[in-house]
């Protein structure tokens, strides 16, 4: 856990240092506090409503929270590209944009920020709870992915449009429960510090097994390089009931989002370079569920499969790919 | 090294249909479309149509949509387009291109003629 | 459709000239939330398949030498030839990268004297 969050590891004190014991005793705990705190901060917001006029419709929206150029975007269905997800779109800040039924409209909204309009009847129609995903490719970052569903309303007989509080409420009741782990786990641990507060202060010290993330200029083709590149993701409903869908949004009904940001991914730097990326707020509600899916999103359940890195805006090419980095 | 081998040229007669191949490597097939583009003898380039492999739901540029049909075939990393109700202006190269044009195959002469 | 012009359809220069060649678009290739624009340039040598020279109306591809210079904006797009070389003898083909169906240029056929 320590490895992949980057959080920097306890050694025994060095001889002559003892002397500095009071001090770092308490800058430790907060320290230590900082990183629990900050770890999930989120990278990736991944946005997912469904047009109350048009029940087949979904607007997707992704964003990246990065400070490094984002050089390719994809948009996939049913998991994370690669690990049986459906491309939809890929997005290019300088070459375009692609896109394939059931998408109706992809387009850049900032440069940071994209949105696609999905509609379709039959097999190719989303449902309630799929799945979406947007990767990033960015640099210096790499590969960052992050994944959203729109939660199914509980009740299909409604008939009046669900308001958001219940439906991300239902969401929150598995996160907190993520969430209070990780608090548990903090709080555990000042509690074994304050317990050892009279022995040396450890020293803090970057972890040596760390995982480093590939260069972003580096692409490889090979199964190898493939299968080193694996990024969290979190994946919240993936089974498809449309029949869940058919009263719960009558014409006329006002259309609703569900926020999910979350980071996923390869860290080059500590965490205290991104430890201060801001979480996109959309009402205090929504803000707050924001956060816990970013904390929620640090240690996720598992992990995705290999993914491609294309840090060039245009895929494998320069780094040797139908897209590359220059 | 992104490599895109086309199959050999071609010798049709008309009102027949041709099925001509593009077999990608070097890259992960999977993550990236691909489009193909017609040209005319001392003509220029025309869009035909692209196809994601990991989705199999083409997009075709009007003009070419009744004669037209692009597949996948995920299995060997290649591209299929096939041809229909062949006519002397079908007569053409045949380029597959990936993603965004980058890398293109050596092209597919098509020629109709009876 | 968008409908890409380019002009002039051919010209004849020496070696170490500059060339300037034209492409208007129908529509405007500008992305207004990006503000890139969706704009391609490709050599074609006789024989060969097309390769890209330009991308985003002035990015140029990896390996391309830098005395192709590609600019303009919405529709106006020029790709300039600082100092013509003898292996440049090629048609030049502008491209809309913006909407499907993406649209090339007639293109601009380059001969050296």
């Known amino acids: 856990m320590r490895t992949e969050a980057q959080v920097p590891a306890l050694q025994p004190p060095e001889p002559g240092l003892e002397g500095a014991m009071g001090h770092r005793t308490l800058v430790l705990p907060w320290v230590l506090l900082t990183l629990c705190v900050t770890a999930g901060t989120p990278e990736v917001w991944v946005q997912v409503r469904m047009e109350a006029t048009e029940l087949s419709s979904f607007t997707i929206r992704c964003g990246f929270l990065g400070s490094g150029s984002i050089s390719l975007v994809t948009v996939s269905w049913g998991g994370p590209n690669g690990a049986g997800g459906t491309t939809l779109a890929v997005l290019h800040p300088e070459r375009g944009i692609r896109q394939w039924a059931p998408a109706r409209q992809a387009r850049w909204e900032t440069q940071s920020s994209i949105s696609l309009i999905l509609e379709g009847s039959g097999a190719s129609s989303p449902c309630a709870n799929t799945t979406f995903c947007c990767k990033f490719a960015s640099f210096p970052e790499g590969s960052w992915e992050a994944c959203g569903s729109l939660p199914p309303s509980s009740d299909p007989g409604l008939s009046a449009p669900p308001t958001p509080a219940p439906i991300l409420r239902a969401d929150l009741a598995g996160i907190l429960g993520v969430s209070g782990v990780l608090l548990f786990g903090c709080v555990y641990l000042l509690h074994l510090l304050r317990r050892h507060k009279h022995r040396p202060a450890p020293r803090l010290q970057p972890s040596r097994t760390s995982p480093q993330a590939p260069r972003a200029r580096a692409w490889a083709p090979s199964q190898a390089s493939q299968a080193a590149l694996h990024v969290p993701y979190a994946t919240i409903n993936t089974s498809c009931r449309p029949a869940t869908l058919d009263t719960a949004h009558p014409h006329g009904g006002p259309s609703w989002w569900a926020s999910l940001p979350t980071h996923a991914a390869h860290r080059p730097q500590g965490p205290a370079a991104w430890a201060s990326t801001p979480i996109p707020a959309r009402g205090s509600f929504v803000s707050v569920e924001n956060g816990l899916y970013a904390q929620a999103g640090e240690r996720p359940p598992h992990t995705g499969p290999g993914l491609t890195l294309f840090p060039d805006p245009r895929g494998p090419r320069a780094m040797e790919g139908p897209l590359g980095v220059r | 090294e992104v490599q895109l081998q086309q199959s050999g040229p071609e010798l049709v007669k008309p009102g027949a249909s041709v099925k001509i191949s593009c077999k990608a490597s070097g890259y992960t097939f999977t993550d990236y479309s691909m489009n193909w583009v017609k040209q005319s003898h001392g003509k220029s380039l025309e869009w035909i149509g692209d196809i994601t492999p990991n989705n199999g739901s083409p997009n075709y540029n009007q003009k070419f949509k009744d004669k037209a049909t692009l597949t996948v075939d995920k299995s060997s990393s290649t591209v299929y387009m096939e041809l229909r109700s062949l006519t002397s202006e079908d007569s053409a190269v045949y380029y597959c291109a990936s993603l965004f044009f980058d890398y293109w195959g050596h092209g597919t002469t098509l020629t109709v003629s009876s | 459709d968008i409908v890409m012009t380019q002009s002039p359809s051919s010209l004849s220069v020496s070696a170490g000239e500059k060339v300037t060649m034209s492409c208007k678009s129908s529509?405007?290739?500008?992305?207004?939330?990006?503000?890139?624009?969706?704009l391609a340039w490709y050599q074609q040598k006789p024989g060969q398949p097309p390769k890209l020279l330009i991308y985003?109306?002035?990015t140029r591809d990896s390996g391309v030498p830098d005395r192709f210079t590609g600019s303009g904006s919405g529709t106006d797009f020029t790709l300039t030839i600082t100092s013509v070389q003898a292996e440049d003898l090629a048609v030049y083909y502008c491209q809309n990268d913006h909407t499907y169906p993406y649209t090339f240029g007639g293109g601009t056929k380059l001969e050296i004297k």
């Open positions: 985003g109306a002035s």
């Open positions: 529509q405007s290739l500008l992305n207004s939330g990006n503000q890139k624009n969706y």
